[in-house]
Every structure is written in structure tokens, then in C-alpha cells.
Amino acid sequence: IWELKKDVYVVELDWYPDAPGEMVVLTCDTPEEDGITWTLDQSSEVLGSGKTLTIQVKEFGDAGQYTCHKGGEVLSHSLLLLHKKEDGIWSTDILKDQKEPKNKTFLRCEAKNYSGRFTCWWLTTISTDLTFSVKSSRGSSDPQGVTCGAATLSAERVRGDNKEYEYSVECQEDSACPAAEESLPIEVMVDAVHKLKYENYTSSFFIRDIIKPDPPKNLQLKPLKNSRQVEVSWEYPDTWSTPHSYFSLTFCVQVQGKSKREKKDRVFTDKTSATVICRKNASISVRAQDRYYSSSWSEWASVPCS
Amino acid sequence: RAVPGGSSPAWTQCQQLSQKLCTLAWSAHPLVGHMDLREEGDEETTNDVPHIQCGDGCDPQGLRDNSQFCLQRIHQGLIFYEKLLGSDIFTGEPSLLPDSPVGQLHASLLGLSQLLQPEGHHWETQQIPSLSPSQPWQRLLLRFKILRSLQAFVAVAARVFAHGAATLSP
């Protein structure tokens, strides 16, 4: 058993049929010694008396808010949550496996630049009685500070018969050094509580590996005289790290016909313009990637040819 | 050329070669070994590879103030990785494919380090890996880790040289 926060405790249980459970001793936070009784949740049934209460925690029915009273007055509370371990593996019932980039990916994180700011998100099908708490640091043995905001519900989607809820959180490294080569990864830890079930999820990454630039901006076409060719130009996204002579991007320019089956023409360039042939009803798209480190491509910025 | 104590390197040449290094480092990894890499424990990355850290002067402001600190750090890293890529981690079994880019990568690391420090000039305090023989069963994981680490190192080096070529070239 360990303390998650004041008056909230997590009991770690090996979860299998007829498991013996964990013996837990609760102590009433009071100077009083006599006439103390204990109840669980809203029930008025007295579970025991005395300053301490010993219980055997085996299942969710044994978890909940234990309250000690004296003469009708509440003295203190202890909320017990359960953390299940099945076959040596902690349960992951609350969050959905996003399976990208690999199985057992519950948290996904992205950064738009090297400033030390990043966003993480996760999915669940649970809509109520759900709380999240997020902590982060750079490194684990001698952790350096990363400040995370509160997790918020950022999207709702319908998937078949189920509703899916996306939560996200923004974090910022306290003393970021955008030009340095990271040697210690960022660690993100999410505590999830659904009713009386506790779970924790972690992710470890370098900012460089989660970089995904915003799409190029101000995408424009300029027809070239007496030619089917056009000059496409664009600019670095505002959110990208500066100076651009140091934090350089590379670009992919694509000409795509109306039909998905039509052959795509692609050009790769380090410049912020390119000359391509504009076909009727086609569109021109440009995306960006860090020039020197192969992290994710941005989403496409597109303009129609006509 | 970055002569100790002073003059500028051939920024544009360094930029071109460092960008080539980036491409090679990514084409060399993941290496096709004789078997799949299983998920391995996160033990410390091999041989305490040198990292370009915050105080090394490799940020745009640091380069403007005095690029020598940064260039020395890059040079140390290049020599370190050149030694690693020439070690039995890469020359031993499981053998690399004959057309593996590791050979080119190895040669390019040497080439860039020589551009930064021609024969006869010496920056002190080289951090050289102490390379005891690696067991064959460790090598795939070591290669994987070294190349991942090298990708990050050469990315920073390439940014330095790109910025230098754009803003510090005579």
C-alpha cells in the first residue's frame, strides 16, 4: 500500500481467483483514543472500533472511502483504490491501446518544435468517474523539471457503437536547451483513476523523436508564362524553431489528381519553392520534416491547381 | 579549416558532408541483422558516447561568440563514433551486408573530422572509447543503440554547419 495523495491510498493486488489479498491497517487521524468507529462509503454499518482498523482487501467491494467517527462527528477519511496485477502485469483497463507506433502504446506525444513544449494524449471509452494526473521529468535518476498542466477532454468521437474520449495535456520543460543533443529522455507518467480502480501509464521519449512540424504556411502558386508549369512557394510554419538557418526543414511537394488512383508526382526540396506541372483538377500539397533528423512529417498544406 | 586556436572551418564543405552523414546514418539504421531485434532493457547507452550539451556553445549565439568550443566538441564526437564504427561491434558477426552504408558512414565520419582538424593540429582531451571485445550476441543491440545515438549527434552537427555556412562564412 502507498499514498497517492493526502488521504488516498493505492493497494496493489495480485488478481487471480481466491487470491489472499492484502492486509491493510488504517489509522484514524485524531488525537482521540476511545469511542472511535469505522464505516465504509455511505453505509452506516460499523466495521470496527478503535483507533486502527485492520481489513483484508481482496476485491473492489473492499475498496472505497473508510471513515472514522466519534459520536456522530467525522474524524478522518482514507480512500482506498485498487491497482490490479494479473499474471505479473499491471492492468491497463482504463486507457485504449492506440497501437501506434507499436502495440501497448497508451500515451502518444508530439512536439511542434525544439522549445521543450510537447502535448500528450490518450483515449478511453469511459465517460464518468474518471480523473487523470500527469507528472513529467527529464531523466529518472536525477530528474530535471518538466511542468504539465491539467489533463482536459480534447475530443469525443463515435467509433461504431462506442463513444471514444480523447484527453490531452500540455507540458513544458523548465530549462529547455533546443540546440543541445538530448542524452536523457523525457519521462511522462499518467495516473488514471476510474471509480476505485487505479492504473498508471508511462511514456519515455526524446523530443527529437516526437517532433512533428506544423504544415508549411502561405502556400501559393504562380503560373509561369507560356508553360503548364507553376512555381509553388511556401513559408516555414510560425511554430517552428528559429533561426531557420539552424533549425532547417526539408519539404515534400506533391501533385495529386482528383482521383486517388492517379499517379502522384513528388519532389523533395530544401528550398521554400519548387516548380511543378499543374494538371487540371489536381491539387498541390506540401509538407515539412526536420532536415537533419527523420522524425514525423507534418500534415499536408494544399491548394487547388485551378 | 578549424585550426586549434582560431581560424574558421570550411563551413560549406562541412555542411555538405554533415548533411550526407545524416542521410547515411538514417539509411544504416535499422540495420538488417540476421534476426529481429527483440525489445531490450534500457541499459545505459553504449560506451558513454559524447553528447553535444547545453554548455558546448553549439547554439546559434554560442557559435557567433566563439565557434571553437563547439567545433572541438563535434570533432571529439566524430572521432569517437569513427572508432566505434571501426570496432568489432560493426566488423564482427553478425556480418553487415556487403552494400551496407556503414562503410560509407565510417569513411565520412573520418572525412569530416579531418576537415575540422587537418593533420598536424591537435585538440587536446580526446574522449576515446575504451573498446573491449563485444560478444556477438550483444552486437545487434549495440549497433542499434550506437546508430540511434549517432543520428542525434550528426543532426546537431549538421545544424551547426548549416548555420555556420549561412551566417559565419567569410
Epitope: - | 534476426m35 572508432k83 570496432s87 566488423t91 564482427g92 556480418s95 550476441w137
Partner: antibody, heavy 115, light 107 residues
């Protein structure tokens, strides 16, 4: 094509030294290790050690440490194995081989130690 | 050191027979096991590497299997040129060690 060509047979007296050469051709010499293996008459194979031509790093079988020295001359793409303080039970065919998972061995050099 | 034990030490077989040679390592060597064929007066010739991977130019009748400590070399249909001594080798860790050999003779 890849070839490893070894020096000719040697007859040595007990206590002497022998140096066997292995000339490589048909590939970039410093890209692979050179292993040395020996086989006593009618016996099995015994690994002696390897050298990395790229940095002259060696790894010797404990059994031969102190008696064996492996070297290379990269200018001629040649590897050498010197065995000192020869005894009669060092009589064997000595082979050089490129990485185990590469199917390239020298033809062998018979070293006879006899008084 | 990892001991490599081959069995049988020798066997007699006829052309066309299916022949199986086993090799046991004294501790796990994953799939870092190689098989060689050696004929009198010749250098060993690599047949199979990393337990089951075939070498170009080696007939497909030679195959390997196993992992950990127990390995097998199979010759699906013995040919006259296959009469030789076969060795397995630990390619996992130093010192590299070989089995004592299995001599395949004509019945």
C-alpha cells in the same frame, strides 16, 4: 572473388616461434574480422582468436594468451598469426577465416613441431 | 566456456538416406549456431549459419533447426559427396567453441 591465401607449411623445433600469413583479396580488408582456428591431426577445430584489421584490436582465446600475437598489414591486406614457445602438441593445420557467417577460409598451413 | 556436444560421433548411412546430426550447447546460445562440413585435407566449409540460414551454393538438402541449447542438422537425402565430418560451432560468445565432430561414413 573473395580469397584467403595462406603461407606454406613450416617445420619448427620445440621452443621456437612460427608466423603464418593470410593474404586477403576480393573485398575491403578492414570490413571484417580475421579469425584463426587450428586443427591437430585427427582432432577437432579450436578457435585461437581474432584480429580486427580496422583498428588492430585483438581477442585471444585464454588458452593461447601470452603465446599468440595476431597482426595485420593493411597495405598488403595480410593478416599474421605468430605462435611462440612451440610444443609438439602445437602440431596442427592453422586456418584463417573471415567472419563465421561468411563462407571464406584459407586453405590451411601445416605447422609441424618436432625435435 | 560453452561446451558443444555432438551426437552421434559417427554414423553409417546409404545414399538417399535422411541423416540427422544433433548438437547440444552447455548453455543457451540463442540461434548463434553454425554448421560446417569438412573433407580430409580441406578447410571446413560453412553449410548453415545462425541455426537455419542457408548459404548460397550449398544444396537445399542441408537444413538446420533448433534454438537455445538443442540444434539439428538434417541432410534430407544423402548424396555421395556428403560423406565427410560435420562440426557445429558456438558463435554466441567467447571463446568460440566447436563440437567434436560427427563423421558420416558409407554403410
Amino acid at each position: 572473388q573473395v580469397q584467403l591465401v595462406q603461407s606454406g607449411a613450416e617445420v619448427k623445433k620445440p621452443g621456437a616461434s612460427v608466423k603464418v600469413s593470410c593474404k586477403a583479396s576480393g573485398y575491403t580488408f578492414n570490413r571484417y574480422l580475421i579469425h584463426w582456428v587450428r586443427q591437430a591431426p585427427g582432432q577437432g577445430l579450436e578457435w585461437m582468436g581474432y584480429i580486427n584489421p580496422n583498428n588492430a584490436g585483438t581477442n585471444y582465446n585464454e588458452k593461447f594468451k601470452g603465446r599468440v600475437t595476431m597482426t595485420t598489414d593493411t597495405s598488403t591486406s595480410t593478416a599474421y598469426m605468430e605462435l611462440r614457445s612451440l610444443r609438439s602438441d602445437d602440431t596442427a593445420v592453422y586456418y584463417c577465416a573471415r567472419n563465421w557467417d561468411q563462407a571464406y577460409w584459407g586453405q590451411g598451413t601445416l605447422v609441424t613441431v618436432s625435435s | 566456456d560453452i561446451q558443444m556436444t555432438q551426437s552421434p560421433s559417427s554414423l553409417s548411412a546409404s545414399v538417399g538416406d535422411r541423416v540427422t546430426i544433433t548438437c547440444r550447447a552447455s548453455q543457451s546460445i540463442s540461434d548463434y549456431l553454425h554448421w560446417y562440413q569438412q573433407k580430409p585435407g580441406k578447410a571446413p566449409k560453412l553449410l548453415i549459419y545462425y541455426t537455419s540460414q542457408s548459404i548460397s551454393g550449398v544444396p537445399s538438402r542441408f537444413s538446420g533447426s533448433g534454438s537455445g541449447t538443442d540444434f539439428t542438422l538434417t541432410i534430407s537425402s544423402l548424396q555421395p559427396e556428403d560423406f565427410a565430418t560435420y562440426y557445429c560451432q558456438n558463435g554466441h560468445s567467447f571463446p568460440f567453441t566447436f563440437g567434436q565432430g560427427t563423421k558420416v561414413e558409407i554403410k
